[in-house]
Amino acid sequence: QAGPLPKPTLWAEPGSVISWGNSVTIWCQGTLEAREYRLDKEESPAPWDRQNPLEPKNKARFSIPSMTEDYAGRYRCYYRSPVGWSQPSDPLELVMTGAYSKPTLSALPSPLVTSGKSVTLLCQSRSPMDTFLLIKERAAHPLLHLRSEHGAQQHQAEFPMSPVTSVHGGTYRCFSSHGFSHYLLSHPSDPLELIVSGSLEDPRPSPTRSVSTAAGPEDQPLMPTGSVPHSGLRRHWE
């Protein structure tokens, strides 16, 4: 008896973080023996959608012409072959931005920081939110979460970095999210350029938690150190 059918691969184009109103295509790639593809969305009746395979039958396309809140969430796909259904794909998390107005991102004491010193990036929302995310452009794993505990909502989150090195320099944005769904994010903040001076001989920072990635040091996720602020927010690494 043959083993279980290999799980398909699930991905989104142009990506898994989509602005409200934009189109996105979800692809599920299985094998040439696939007869049907099924897409399931967490907390929605299954199947969420079914599609016949595209020639040469090893993948199917699920189109979302205009991104809305209803499409944001966690997806898995399956394919059916003559011997039955496959294992589920790894999950795809489809995130929508533009659900809330943009937060404000600033650097304390300044976005111009000397290597070896400390800086705190402050993401502030004029209405209470329960998750704040910090994103560094062109980082392989750019998301940092600060999520409030016990449902308490906050107007801000602090992302402390110490000691700062050249790796911390770059362009940052932050997002905020409400308790309705963590797949719904605000518009992005305006970008903040963090400039690190005197950093020619800096050693690479040692992350506070190891990260498995094939990327080089410049692509490591941002890893600020220091205690989480007294705001009731808890740090989550994504």
């Epitope: 209405s127 107007h155 801000q156």
Partner: antibody, heavy 120, light 110 residues
Framework: EVQLVESGGGLVQPGGSLRLSCAAS?????????ISWVRQAPGKGLEWVSS?????????YYATWAKGRFTISRDNSKNTLYLQMNSLRAEDTAVYYC???????????WGQGTLVTVSS | DLVMTQSPSTLSASVGDRVTITCQAS??????LAWYQQKPGKPPKLLIY???TLASGVSSRFSGSGSGTEFTLTISSLQPDDVATYYC????????????FGGGTKVEIK
Amino acid sequence: EVQLVESGGGLVQPGGSLRLSCAASGFSLSSSYWISWVRQAPGKGLEWVSSIDSGSVGITYYATWAKGRFTISRDNSKNTLYLQMNSLRAEDTAVYYCARHGDNWALDLWGQGTLVTVSS
Amino acid sequence: DLVMTQSPSTLSASVGDRVTITCQASQSINSWLAWYQQKPGKPPKLLIYKASTLASGVSSRFSGSGSGTEFTLTISSLQPDDVATYYCQHGYIRGDLDNVFGGGTKVEIK
């Protein structure tokens, strides 16, 4: 020209209802702003009524005293903000302004206001 | 509850005087404070945002300072055109607020 224009005010009896409108031009209500209703009773100070977020979810907040009687909403296709006011009382008599919260978190654009008079 | 307390409620000063209005928040609002000027029959006009930044087109006679809970609006040299009521406002929006504005300060010329 970037502006807000309120309409829908008038004389209404106590216990009655009224819907105010605020038409935005020169910018989109669905861009990254909050919009609020602020009122001012004759000879009194400014009083925040309600706000709605520009994001697609459209989170709303109300002053504690406005909850249950007032409802803020928006129609992006008409680029218009609304305030539905029910169970009106004499103390709701005021000029009602709509105002936009800018990136600086301040109210950087105001309408001219519309007068609501609650009287029998 | 976040409450803005403005003082004085009325202020009478001579032309050319330096005038100061204060606004106190019952809890920290960082620098998210704005000041407005309102003349009778007109909507408010933004003067200062983020506690100390002058809004576009506003006279440099006006300045703002403070952070956290204590804020000040200063008119360096009072002019007849400055006769108006001034309001402070914090920038937060949430559901536990009675108001986001201070009670107002009416400025008159002696």
